[in-house]
Interface confidence: medium
């Protein structure tokens, strides 16, 4: 059979048919269905939802839908011994206690099993001591405290505001500074937009609202007890003392009403500058300790959460490819939520559900994709990307040989301003071409393309008339596929205005107030933004699975490699004397990038000209495209981060959410002026340049003519 016969492509069964089948009303209905009760990882409710999704995906027409279970380390509060923080007087009496739960939203007062706010994987403990306010607890905040202000956090309880960076990085930084406990809180400066009311009257965070979340530093390991291998029935588990990424000090989150009570008494040093002040009516003094009248009072934490090995369930659906069944395009998003999951994750899960339904409709009419499409509903993402990582560890040999692309599908919205895309450069042209074919849902852009509204609202800083596309970082389920396995990956969602704070998330993130009503009343009443995201995610999957030549453009990788080389070189050139002293040269990297650019250009020319009716040559060219991302993987991984193996991109060592380019060189250069052994430090810079140059050159050679 020819490709066309095998995939039964007729005008009715093209991308338009798939996109036209996607309906906003269905996404709305699915979101409602997925958000009526909590679906916390490891609970019976989330197992039942897994079985429901399995059943519905079968009804929609997938070839097979299986549950894949693993027994992983999770963390829960003690139901009879709640976590809280108190202010104690000199006699040890508790004169103030933080709240034990969030006031439930209207209509949800009688819902059971709402997990109270907690920091997942916090150890137990009851530390007491003086408080130090550490701003966002970023690396630079601790530099400011320790180096400039000479404030010692050793033996102190630190209080940090959420935002800017992943909470696990905050805890790691506090541990390294010697703190004995961490209090995390949401400041209105970061979680209360001016001119908007608090939930339930608007989308802002009320004073009693609290952000849950894990505080691990897994660096891509997955289940903390089985790094590198699946947590299956015969797994060998590490002891808890050897577990990967667990925090060593108690941590607890609070809302801004409770934070006010702690911060208003702070004494000691004044904030170093206005960037340390939030929006509460408190001085934002750094401490340590309380001011004069209250100087004998201390803060005490009471943390009783437990870590438990618990069964989790992924749902894996398969739509077999007609021509290349051994080539996998994966669409995955998580199902587990902290509470109702109105945005995170169910706004994404509802979109995946509708995409599956649309593909199933086409399949029932006799169509099949060229390549196999795998659909995944991941469990335990909130506990450290555990479901996706365990499944990828179990199937790593298949994935590294057969994985074409992974499209992530967590929250579909974090705002309703414009599109946001983070992806491999290989997908830039796919995203551009697709969004030019889709209608913009934005007011004022009626009849215009999504590409046009996106470009107007979020322009590329480098290329006029093009939209911004960002680097992949982490903090979501694409991590194992991209950073560990080197499978081309991408994600898309609707976002807020990009000029506002980037990493604080939306105000009600991970709170009890993240409900169906939040979305339906305030973010997307018509579900038009959800539909657009479904079209982008689904359209990418359709093209990746169905186009005869893979829709990857290797020339775009060449462009960014040059940009990243320029950037890392300019960082290094802040130390011209040391560069000279230690003979540090970037010539090998720039040479490799130049070679990559030339070889990619020639490959693209051959891609235009080859005989696409020859299945062997077609497969050969597609394999070169598929394996290009894989070629950037270093089997040894990054220093001290063996599961981050991509040489071009890794999550920032200072913020898991952000992507860093040439991370090995970047980390070697970071704060190099403070290193005790400059010769050794600059030697590591040279080694990392060598690794990067070699990897870029090796990747270039995979695109050369094969013989």
């Amino acid at each position: 059979k020819s490709s066309n016969e095998a995939t039964n492509i007729t005008p009715k069964h093209n991308m338009k048919a798939f996109l036209d089948e996607l309906k906003a009303e269905n996404i709305k209905k699915f979101l409602y269905n997925f958000t009526q009760i909590p679906h916390l990882a490891g609970t019976e409710q989330n197992f039942q939802l897994a079985k429901q999704i399995q059943s519905q995906w079968k009804e929609f027409g997938l070839d097979s839908v299986e549950l894949a279970h693993y027994d992983v380390l999770l963390s829960y509060p003690n139901k009879t011994h709640p976590n809280y923080i108190s202010i104690i007087n000199e006699d040890g009496n508790e004169i103030f206690n933080t709240s034990l739960f969030e006031p439930p939203p209207p209509g949800y007062e009688n819902v059971s099993d709402i997990v109270p706010p907690f920091s997942a994987f916090s150890p137990q403990g009851m530390p007491e001591g003086d408080l130090v306010y550490v701003n966002y607890a970023r690396t630079e905040d601790f530099f400011k405290l320790e180096r400039d202000m000479k404030i010692n956090c050793s033996g102190k309880i630190v209080i940090a505001r959420y935002g800017k960076v992943f909470r696990g990085n905050k805890v790691k930084n506090a541990q390294l500074a010697g703190a004995k406990g961490v209090i995390l809180y949401s400041d209105p400066a970061d979680y209360f937009a001016p001119g908007v009311k608090s939930y339930p009257d608007g989308w802002n965070l009320p004073g009693g609202g609290v952000q849950r979340g894990n505080i691990l530093n897994l660096n891509g390991a997955g289940d903390p007890l089985t790094p590198g291998y699946p947590a299956n029935e015969y797994a060998y588990r590490r002891g808890i003392a050897e577990a990967v990424g667990l925090p060593s000090i108690p941590v607890h989150p609070i809302g801004y009403y409770d934070a006010q009570k702690l911060l208003e008494k702070m004494g000691g040093s004044a904030p170093p500058d206005s960037s340390w002040r939030g929006s509460l009516k408190v001085p934002y003094n750094v401490g340590p300790g309380f001011t004069g009248n209250f100087s004998t009072q201390k803060v005490k934490m009471h943390i009783h959460s437990t870590n438990e090995v618990t069964r989790i369930y992924n749902v894996i659906g398969t739509l077999r490819g007609a021509v290349e069944p051994d080539r996998y395009v994966i669409l995955g998003g998580h199902r587990d939520s902290w509470v109702f999951g109105g945005i995170d994750p169910q706004s994404g899960a509802a979109v995946v559900h509708e995409i599956v339904r649309s593909f199933g409709t086409l399949k029932k009419e006799g169509w099949r994709p060229r390549r196999t499409i795998l659909f995944a509903s991941w469990d335990a993402e909130e506990f450290g990307l555990l479901g996706s990582t365990e499944w990828a560890e179990e199937n790593s040999r298949l994935l590294q040989e057969r994985g074409v692309a992974y499209i992530n599908a967590d929250s579909s919205i974090e705002g309703n301003y414009t599109l946001r895309v983070d992806c491999t450069p290989l997908m830039y042209s796919l995203v551009h071409n697709l969004t030019k074919e889709l209608k913009s849902p934005d007011e004022g852009f009626e009849g215009k393309s999504l590409y046009e509204s996106w470009t107007k609202k979020s322009p590329s800083p480098e290329f006029s008339g093009m939209p911004r596309i960002s680097k992949l970082g982490s903090g979501n389920d694409f991590e194992v596929f991209f950073q560990r396995l080197g499978i081309a990956s991408g994600r898309a969602r609707y976002t807020k205005n990009w000029e506002t704070n980037k990493f604080s998330g939306y105000p009600l993130y991970h709170s009890v107030y993240e409900t169906y009503e939040l979305v339906e009343k305030f973010y997307d009443p018509m579900f038009k933004y959800h539909l657009t995201v479904a079209q982008v995610r689904g359209g990418m999957v359709f093209e990746l699975a169905n186009s005869i030549v893979l829709p990857f453009d290797c020339r775009d990788y060449a462009v960014v490699l040059r940009k990243y080389a320029d950037k890392i070189y300019s960082i290094s050139m802040k130390h011209p004397q040391e560069m000279k002293t230690y003979s540090v040269s970037f010539d090998s990297l720039f040479s490799a990038v130049k070679n990559f650019t030339e070889i990619a250009s020639k490959f693209s020319e051959r891609l235009q000209d080859f005989d696409k009716s020859n299945p062997i040559v077609l497969r050969m060219m597609n394999d070169q495209l598929m394996f290009l991302e894989r070629a950037f993987i270093d089997p040894l991984g990054l220093p001290d981060r063996p599961f981050y193996r991509h040489v071009i991109y890794a999550p920032s060592s200072h913020n898991k959410y952000a992507g860093e380019s040439f991370p090995g060189i970047y980390d070697a250069l970071f704060d190099i002026e403070s290193k005790v052994d400059p010769s050794k430090a600059w030697g590591e810079v040279k080694r990392q340049i060598y690794v990067a140059a070699f990897t870029v050159q090796a990747a270039a050679e995979t695109l050369s003519e094969v013989a």
């Epitope: 960076v165 960002s470 970082g473 990009w498 940009k563 320029d566 959410y657 952000a658």
Partner: nanobody
Framework: QVQLQESGPGLVKPSQTLSLTCTVS??????????WSWVRQHPGKGLEWIGF???????HYNPSLKSRVIISVDTSKNQFSLKLNSVTAADTAVYYC???????????RGQGTLVTVSS
Amino acid sequence: QVQLQESGPGLVKPSQTLSLTCTVSGGSISNSGYYWSWVRQHPGKGLEWIGFIYYNGSIHYNPSLKSRVIISVDTSKNQFSLKLNSVTAADTAVYYCARDGDDYGDYLRGQGTLVTVSS
């Protein structure tokens, strides 16, 4: 640590030109990978993007303000500037200069300066 500081008159007469300068300290304005933008916030409203200049010199403006805006850079002084001409009372706002990058993590903003347009 990079810091940004806006400077310029706090009061501008209608129909005149608003001129602001942003001084960057703790890092070079010509560093590869960053771009330098101006945004403003009207009282009680969200942030409005005005425009940005990339380290390589390319400039982008908000289409709704394009006809009235000029953003320029002086690398020798490590400064970039905003000129907004033909101002009206609707241009009264807190004006911020900001640094961004091709990533969502590179964002950094100055303290802001209130500019009132009034005769």
